[in-house]
Structures are given as C-alpha cells and as structure tokens.
Interface confidence: low
C-alpha cells in the first residue's frame, strides 16, 4: 500500500522536511503533490511526468520544494504555515489513480528563557516571591529547577499559569538558592540563566563570646558579638546601658573592678529594620577570689539522691581541684567530674559521702582552697539493735534495755511490750522483774525526715529455771573441704555456763574446732564427712542445768573417684557385660556412661547383652553431685575376644 513518511515529523522553523514515499507502484505515468488532505487543483504544489522527466509547479508551489524521481518531496526553509497534511496523487500507466496522505508539524526554535521576579529582596517570614519564566510561548512546556534539582514538595511552593509562574510563600533564609526555568517543545529545550534568591533575614539573637563571665583585674577584656543576618548586621555595644561603640568587637585592655557590669550587644539589620540584643554580666575580681562550694541538694537522701557540688566562681583559664576527706578524689563510678572539673557529681549518695569536700582554684603560684563543706546525708533508720543480747533473766534482777539504730537525723525511739506502747525513750528500765515481765519487747526507731520506721523484737524470758537450750547453725548443708559451720547455743543468758558434746563425748582437741562467745558458739572449720555427727549443747547455772536435743550435721561431699565393678577387663564374645559404677557422695550422685567418648545412658549400671569384639573400647563412668557442684570420672578399657580364643591381657588397658 502506498504510504507517506515524514522525516522528521516535528520540524523546527527554518529546517527542512522530507516526505518519503513507500511502496510506489510500478509502471507510472506521473504523480502530483497537493497541500492538504485531498486532491485540489488550487492547492497543487508540483507535478511530475515520468516520460518527459518534467516537473511542473502548481499554484501552491513556494519555490522551496524539490521533487525526486522516486516521488519523495523535500521542503526546505520550513515556515510555521507549512504545518499540516500533504497528499500524493499517483497516476499509473493504465491511468488508474492512487493517493496517500502524510503530515508534519512545525514548531518554532525556542529562545533562551529568562526569569523575572516580582520581589528582588523579600523579607523572611513576611514576603512571597513570584518567579515568571519569559517569554510566553505557545505549545511550550515550562519546568523549574532549584539548585539544579527538580522542585521539592512543599506547601509553600506553588506553580501556576501553566507552570510558567513559581510562587514561594512566606520565604525563609533556606529559600536562598539558585533558581532556573526551562522551556521545552518537540523540537527544542532551553534553560535560563540562574537567578539567586536573596532573602533578607535577621538579625537573630546575637551571641557574645567567649562565654565566661569572670575575669581577673589586669586582664584584657575582648568580647565578640555575632548575629545571623542578611545583609550583615551592624553592631553596637553598651556598658551598663551607656553606648560605647559601633563595632562587632569590644576590646578593653587592663580591666579593673570598675569594669564589672552588664555588657549589651545590639545587632541591627537596616534592610529588615529589626534590632536584637543580648546581655552578659561581667565580673572583674580584684585578685583571685577565694573559691566556695555550692550544692544543688543540701539534705540528700541515701541511695535516692544525687548531689552536684560546684566550685564558684567560674573563671576563664582556671584549673579546678577537689579534695574529699583531705585526700584527692578516689576513683569511683559514683564520682563524676564535669569537663572543666568545676562540678563534682556524687551519684546515689551514701552515709559515707558526708565529706568534708573542698575545692581549689589553681593560680600561677598557689592554690586557693574553699572552706570545707560537709554533706548532711539523710539515712536510716537501720534495723535497731537491742542490748544487752541476753534473752533469759532470773527473777529479782533489774531489766535495763537500750535501743540504737543508725539514723540521720537521730531516730526517735518507742518501746512496746507485747504490742502495748510503754514509753518514747531510747532506754527501757524495769526494776525487780518477775515471771510476769516475760514477753515480746519491741523497739521502734523512726526517722522524722525520711518518715521511715524500723523495728526489732526481742523475746525476754524471766524464769528461775534455765530453759531447754537449742542449737542454731549458720550453714545447714556445708560442703566438705570448703565450708565452715558455726553452731550457737540459744538462748543467751546471764551468769550461765555453756557446754558441748559430740556423739555423747566431750569435745575432742582439734585445730579445726574453736569455741568462742563465752563458749556459746562452736565453729568447725573446713568440715569433712567425718564431722557428720550428733552435736549437743548444755547450759547450767547455780540453780539448774539443761541440754539441747542433738543436731546432726549433714556434710555434702563427693563425688569421689568412682569404682567400676567387676574389675574384669577381658570378656569372651557372647557374654553379657554388666558394669556397675559407684562413687562415695552426699547426696547420691548422678551417673552417666560413655563408650569410646559417645554418651550412653544416665544409670548406675550399664548392661549390654551378648557382647562382640565390636564392643571393644573405653568405658567411662561420670558422676556428678549437683549439691557440691563437683564431678568425677573413671575410665576402663574392655577387650572382647572371639569365642574359642584365649583372652590375653591387652596392652594399654
């Protein structure tokens, strides 16, 4: 089928286009080109007769068209009006006609665009800016670039006017950037030069440097002021409200105490019309001041509060030193120094952190010490202790009990007998006691600052007869060769003799046995399994005597090196192998077996029926005592001989 291809389809003004003919029929008489979508003699461009090779211009011929023998049409120096359809009319030798239509579009070559702005000096947080891409061109697409990137998504950015206008609402200093616009059509793309948006802002609150505010007499004072601002701020200095100079830096040499005061920096932006000020108070010391310690917490609570001690005053280029209890600071994770050593922080104070604390300022020739500061750490009350420790008294004596609990502030004490309040004193005195004074004696200690209370209860027995004693132990299951055990004979009674028996015999002489606390306590060092005996204590006075029930010591030991039985190591094939493992241990151990290193069963007896030479190898018994945390093992080599051969001793058994 006859077709027309336009090369190119989109043509720039001034360029050329070729209307290329495809599938031109054979045996042609001639052909003719027309402007438009149909054959119209008034719109004929050119005709061509093949026999004469004669081209004849038509009414629509502009002098820019060239026809080729293959019927293709070249149009040069294209103008906007050339846009549209073109029809080829082919006349064959048999005078049968055939037509085909093609088309192309003409676009102007775009000029380099430029950006116009409605506000060349917008003010931050106040103005909007509208950029417009010039010129306005038909059939062109408009694009925008910020710092050579496509537009970010922002509610403050708005495109309008077919994307030709970019509006920035409420500009900020961050909108200071390079903006470009680009125009595009099918035949060209052009980008504008950059436009830099100059946002006026500030001044922000100025900062005065350096930050330190304490100086020594004779030093130079050199203060610098800076405020973020566009255009750059103009600076003025005021001392105690009086104008000094319009410079960014203020320099006063060889200052004296009279230079102490408030120093104000004022920053002014003439374009935004805004002023901002910052004030710093400068203190000039006549000589290195004696340091002093300030605390953020004068009454810290133990295990609750942290305390920050600060060495005052803050002075530039000064070394700060600290002492606790007249010693340099100990290394402790609870002590922290600030970067400049000026602040010492005690984390989670304890009653031992009272001090005294001193700080010092290092001068050229000496160190100036602060006065010592003592922390008043509130603590307690701890569990009160009632003394004396006796619990048994004879009738007719005086009962004098004293109570004490560590506490700051000092605890307030109350006494209760059998739950009934008696008196609010630290000491309780009852003369000429009788059996009726037996009972529960409670001391209550109260800390009014923390609101905490602690109590201790003591049972007092008043009796002419000594009670039956009992034995208390500090370790009910001691481990052999490791632990010590202390037996104590209860109760503690005045004017009483304490005696001990082991397995019904008086105590043997041994360096591992020790009596203390008026023979009331019997200590066995490095207990052994042989110490697992019956222990009895006795008490006696001039009136009576009594013995405790026996207490048997349960010593944990082992496991010892196990024994595998029977001792045989050579077996005949077909026999049953029945190995038993035993280890002395308290409590009984856990047993397990391994054959050639491979775990087997967790039993005391290992049984294998009808063994063969495949059962040769090392048989290991492992014992473990979970109470002592100890393990042990033994290894035995087993040799199985084939039936009918004499089992000799195997080497390496």
């Amino acid at each position: 089928k006859l077709t027309i291809e336009s090369t190119p389809f989109n043509v720039a003004e001034g360029k050329e286009v070729l209307l290329l003919v495809h599938n031109l029929p054979q045996h042609l008489f001639g052909y003719s080109w027309y402007k438009g979508e149909r054959v119209d003699g008034n719109r004929q461009i050119i005709g061509y007769v093949i026999g004469t090779q004669q081209a004849t211009p038509g009414p629509a011929y502009s002098g820019r068209e060239i026809i080729y023998p293959n019927a293709s049409l070249l149009i040069q120096n294209i103008i906007q009006n050339d846009t549209g359809f073109y029809t080829l009319h082919v006349i064959k030798s048999d005078l049968v006609n055939e037509e085909a239509t093609g088309q192309f579009r003409v676009y102007p070559e775009l000029p380099k665009p430029s950006i116009s702005s409605n506000n060349s000096k917008p003010v931050e947080d106040k103005d909007a800016v509208a950029f417009t891409c010039e010129p306005e061109t038909q059939d062109a697409t408009y694009l925008w670039w910020v710092n050579n990137q496509s537009l970010p998504v922002s509610p403050r950015l708005q495109l309008s006017n077919g994307n030709r206008t970019l509006t920035l609402f409420n500009v900020t200093r961050n909108d200071t950037a390079s903006y470009k616009c680009e125009t595009q059509n099918p035949v060209s793309a052009r980008r504008s030069d950059s436009v830099i948006l100059n946002v006026l802002y500030g001044p922000d609150a100025p900062t005065i440097s350096p930050l330190n505010t304490s100086y020594r007499s004779g030093e130079n004072l050199n203060l610098s002021c800076h405020a973020a601002s566009n255009p750059p701020a103009q600076y003025s200095w005021f001392v105690n409200g009086t104008f000094q100079q319009s410079t960014q830096e203020l320099f006063i040499p060889n200052i004296t105490v009279n230079n102490s005061g408030s120093y104000t920096c004022q920053a002014h932006n003439s374009d935004t019309g805004l002023n901002r000020t910052t004030v710093t108070t400068i203190t000039v010391y006549a000589e290195p001041p004696k340091p002093f310690i300030t605390s953020n917490n004068s009454n810290p609570v133990e295990d609750e509060d942290a305390v920050a001690l600060t060495c005052e005053p803050e002075i530039q280029n000064t070394t700060y030193l600290w002492w606790v209890n007249n010693q340099s600071l100990p290394v402790s994770p609870r002590l922290q120094l600030s970067n400049d050593n000026r602040t010492l922080t005690l984390l989670s104070v304890t009653r031992n952190d009272v001090g005294p604390y001193e700080c010092g300022i290092q001068n050229e020739l000496s160190v100036d010490h602060s006065d010592p500061v003592i922390l008043n750490v509130l603590y307690g009350p701890d569990d009160p202790t009632i003394s004396p420790s006796y619990t048994y008294y004879r009738p007719g004596v005086n009962l004098s009990l004293s109570c004490h609990a560590a506490s700051n502030p000092p605890a307030q004490y109350s006494w209760l007998i059998d739950g009934n309040i008696q008196q609010h004193t630290q000491e309780l005195f009852i003369s000429n006691i009788t059996e009726k004074n037996s009972g529960l004696y409670t001391c209550q200690a109260n800390n009014s600052a923390s609101g905490h209370s602690r109590t201790t209860v003591k049972t007092i027995t008043v009796s002419a007869e000594l009670p039956k004693p009992s034995i208390s132990s500090n370790n009910s299951k001691p481990v052999e060769d490791k632990d010590a055990v202390a037996f104590t004979c209860e109760p503690e009674a005045q004017n009483t003799t304490y005696l001990w028996w082991v397995n019904g015999q008086s105590l043997p002489v041994s360096p591992r046995l020790q009596l203390s606390n008026g023979n009331r306590t019997l200590t066995l060092f490095n207990v052994t399994r042989n110490d697992a005996r019956a222990y009895v204590c006795g008490i006696q006075n001039s009136v009576s005597a009594n013995r405790s029930d026996p207490v048997t010591l349960d010593v944990l030991y082992g496991p010892d090196t196990p024994i595998i039985s029977p001792p045989d190591s050579s077996y005949l094939s077909g026999a049953n192998l029945n190995l038993s493992c035993h280890s002395a241990s308290n409590p009984s151990p856990q047993y397990s077996w391994r054959i050639n290193g491979i775990p087997q069963q967790h039993t005391q007896v290992l049984f294998i029926a009808k063994i063969t030479p495949n059962n040769n190898g090392t048989y290991a018994c492992f014992v473990s005592n979970l109470a002592t945390g100890r393990n042990n093992s033994i290894v035995k080599s087993i040799t199985v001989s084939a039936s009918g051969t004499s089992p000799g001793l195997s080497a390496g058994a």
Partner: nanobody
Framework: EVQLVESGGGLVQPGGSLRLSCAAS????????IGWVRRAPGKEEELVAY????????RYADSVKGRFTISADTSKNTAYLQMNSLRAEDTAVYYC????????????WGQGTTVTVSS
C-alpha cells in the same frame, strides 16, 4: 563455636617444670569446672587436677599432689596447670576438659598437648 586450645607442652628433664595453658573461646569459663586429664600408653586415663571456677573448689590426684597446681584466669578465659618436680611417669598427652556445673561428665575436650619427661 566452643573451642579449647592447649599449649605449653614439650620435652623437659626430670625435676623440671612446665606450665600448660588451656585457652577457651565460645563461652565463659567462670561458670564451669575444668579438669586436666592425661592419657599415657599402657595406662588408664587419669584426672590429675580439677577446679570449679564458681566455687574455687580444687582437687588433685594423689600422684600429683604437692607438685601440680591448677588455676584459672577468668578475665583471660584461660586455665593453667603448673607442673613442678616432673617425673618420667608424668609423660603423657594432657587434655583440658570443661564441664558445666549441671553437666554429666566432660562436655568439651581440647586437642591435647604432649609432655615428655626424659633425661
């Protein structure tokens, strides 16, 4: 991966000393017991020394008591066997073996280091 690497073995004259090291990786030895076990041709395997790092408990075979000392440095995750007054009968391959306190027998073994006592 749990690994035990013994080192320190070698040839020494009778009466001499050696210090064996057992470097552990893949676990913390402070929660374990460590044993030095020796194997010699023609002899039964023998547990010569044993230490439980969580109790400090130590134990020695009668044949090495007073001559060998077992210790452990939990910060270096390493166990040691200091062997003094060495005898010909101490010649063996020495293995370090680790068992946790709840374990049955030795859970992990090293590859062994050879000690030869000979004049």
């Amino acid at each position: 991966e749990v690994q035990l690497v013994e080192s320190g073995g070698g040839l020494v004259q009778p009466g001499g000393s050696l210090r064996l090291s057992c470097a552990a990786s893949g676990f913390n030895i402070k929660d374990t017991c460590i044993g030095w076990v020796r194997r010699a041709p023609g002899k039964e395997e023998e547990l010569v020394a044993y230490i439980c790092n969580y109790t400090g408990y130590t134990r020695y075979a009668d044949s090495v008591k007073g001559r060998f000392t077992i210790s452990a440095d939990t910060s270096k995750n390493t166990a040691y066997l200091q062997m003094n007054s060495l005898r010909a009968e101490d010649t063996a391959v020495y293995y370090c073996a680790i068992t946790s306190y709840h374990g049955q027998g030795y859970n992990y073994w090293g590859q062994g280091t050879t000690v030869t006592v000979s004049s």
